[in-house]
């Protein structure tokens, strides 16, 4: 996360942002918090983006003021108005696009003073993989599928039993471009698997890391999956 302090005027307030990632075609959140003020009408929130002439969003006197908003953000932004009073200046961004990536600044004015902090926003695509027994294969195989990734990720298989094993020789991964010509479907097949072993399919790019686990026994199939956004360090 990044903490910024106001440098102009008599007083400065602490503003904190969290570097985050947006999944294209979905809602995104640009996170920003500040020292609260007791009077909503005294709070001004301005979101700016480097290289963009107009404002991304402005909230003042208790409501949105979009008179100086840049066209590329028209109808796509909102603050959480009921949470501004408690110091939440986070911005909701509709229909995240690749072009939304960049450096944003959250600038705050309250009766206590001014402050700002920068935020690096990455955009791409990421999704949770689903691992299944591959019924099409001649030998016992696992199939790991994730519908949307961008940029192209790496795929690594791992086993709970043989933790240091390299499965690249016994797996095959393909990337299929989705109809919108940006994101790709990831499919990876792991061959010659043994039962009563937990296998993990790990998909990772510079934005996110997702894992799909599967354990096949004689009586059941257990699955588990999770997704983690890779936030970069504060600068």
């Amino acid at each position: 996360f990044i903490i910024g302090f106001g440098i102009s005027g008599r007083h400065s307030i602490t503003v904190t942002t969290l570097t985050s990632a947006g999944n294209i075609g979905e809602d995104g959140i640009l996170s920003c918090t500040f020292e609260p003020d007791i009077k909503l009408s005294d709070i001004v929130i301005q979101w700016l983006k480097e290289g963009v002439t107009g404002l991304v969003h402005e909230f003042k006197k208790g409501k949105d003021d979009l008179s100086d908003q840049d066209e590329m953000f028209r109808g796509r932004t909102a603050v959480f108005a009921d949470q501004v009073i408690v110091g939440n200046a986070s911005l909701r961004l509709k229909n995240v696009q690749l072009t939304d990536a960049g450096t944003y600044k959250c600038y705050i004015i309250t009766s206590k003073g001014k402050g700002n902090a920068k935020l690096e926003y990455k955009t791409g695509a990421f999704s949770i993989p689903e691992v299944n027994v591959d019924s099409n294969a001649s030998s016992e195989s696992l199939r790991c599928e994730a519908p949307r990734w961008f940029p192209q990720p790496t795929v690594v298989w791992a086993s709970q039993v043989d933790q240091g094993a390299n499965f690249s020789e016994v797996s095959n991964t393909s990337f299929e471009l989705n109809p919108e010509n940006v994101t790709m479907k990831v499919v990876s097949v792991l061959y010659n698997v043994t039962i009563n072993t937990t296998y993990s399919c790990m998909i990772e790019n510079d934005i996110a890391k997702a894992t799909g686990d599967i354990r096949v026994t004689d009586s059941e199939i257990k699955r588990q999956s999770h997704l983690q956004l890779l936030n970069s360090k504060a600068s």
């Epitope: 075609g25 979905e26 809602d27 409501k63 949105d64 979009l66 008179s67 109808g75 796509r76 509709k94």
Partner: antibody
Framework: EVQLVQSGAEVKKPGASVKVSCKAS????????IGWVRQAPGQGLEWIGD????????NYNEKFKGRVTITRDTSTSTAYLELSSLRSEDTAVYYC??????????????WGQGTLVTVSS | DIQMTQSPSSLSASVGDRVTITCKAS??????VAWYQQKPGKAPKLLIY???TLQPGVPSRFSGSGSGRDYTLTISSLQPEDFATYYC?????????FGQGTKVEIK
């Protein structure tokens, strides 16, 4: 409670114009987009366009560009749809609807009762 | 402009049936698909938005799913009050677009 109350039915001649009003109450009028949708008899829903009352920004369906104007009066919390050069195929029920999500253009979550516009010579 | 192709245009079903209606976007991808129910002489009612989020007060038998270009509205067990016309709406882009509608009738 969010309420959108539309003006009454209209009968117009081909080539004329019609202006339908939509008075909003129960929320901050300037903070939410308002959209307009029409439905011809026995037909489906057709999006016409929308307006952000806080700034007067508009978006229009290409099909209606040049014939439709969406405006608002913030002092009375009223949005207006004006359609010119009317033809018989403009006969429809016209709905206004509030878009969810404040300044963010969301789905239409609250609707007016509809205004029937009949175009007949 | 994005077009939404909805199918079927009509269907006959009985109370208790599972009903599925689909919408296919002509291009692009985003989660901004909503579903509406409309009864004769009434304004549409929002059921689901953002692909799968149920509008407050809407019964849980209604559900939405989908990704990419394909979206689905499912009624798990059709009730007498569910006989109506259903529309999908794409609202992710600058220009919004409705599907053509699906009329759900009593078999």
């Amino acid at each position: 409670e969010v309420q959108l109350v539309q003006s009454g039915a209209e009968v117009k001649k081909p080539g004329a114009s019609v202006k339908v009003s939509c008075k909003a109450s129960g929320y901050t009028f300037t903070s939410y987009w308002i959209g307009w949708v029409r439905q011809a008899p026995g037909q489906g829903l057709e999006w016409i366009g929308d307006i952000y009352p806080g700034g007067g920004y508009t978006n229009y369906n290409e099909k209606f560009k040049g014939r439709v104007t969406i405006t608002r009066d913030t002092s009375t919390s009223t949005a207006y749809l004006e359609l010119s050069s009317l033809r018989s195929e403009d006969t429809a029920v016209y709905y206004c609807a509030r878009l969810d999500g404040s300044s963010y253009r969301g789905a239409m979550d609250s609707w007016g009762q509809g205004t029937l516009v009949t175009v007949s010579s | 402009d994005i077009q939404m192709t909805q199918s079927p245009s009509s269907l006959s079903a009985s109370v208790g049936d599972r009903v599925t209606i689909t919408c296919k976007a002509s291009q692009g991808f985003n989660k901004y698909v909503a579903w509406y129910q409309q009864k004769p002489g009434k304004a549409p009612k929002l059921l689901i938005y953002y692909t799968s989020t149920l509008q407050p007060g809407v019964p849980s038998r209604f559900s939405g799913s989908g990704s990419g270009r394909d979206y689905t509205l499912t009624i798990s067990s059709l009730q007498p009050e569910d006989f109506a016309t259903y529309y999908c709406l794409q609202y992710g882009n600058l220009l919004y677009a409705f599907g053509q509608g699906t009329k759900v009738e009593i078999k």
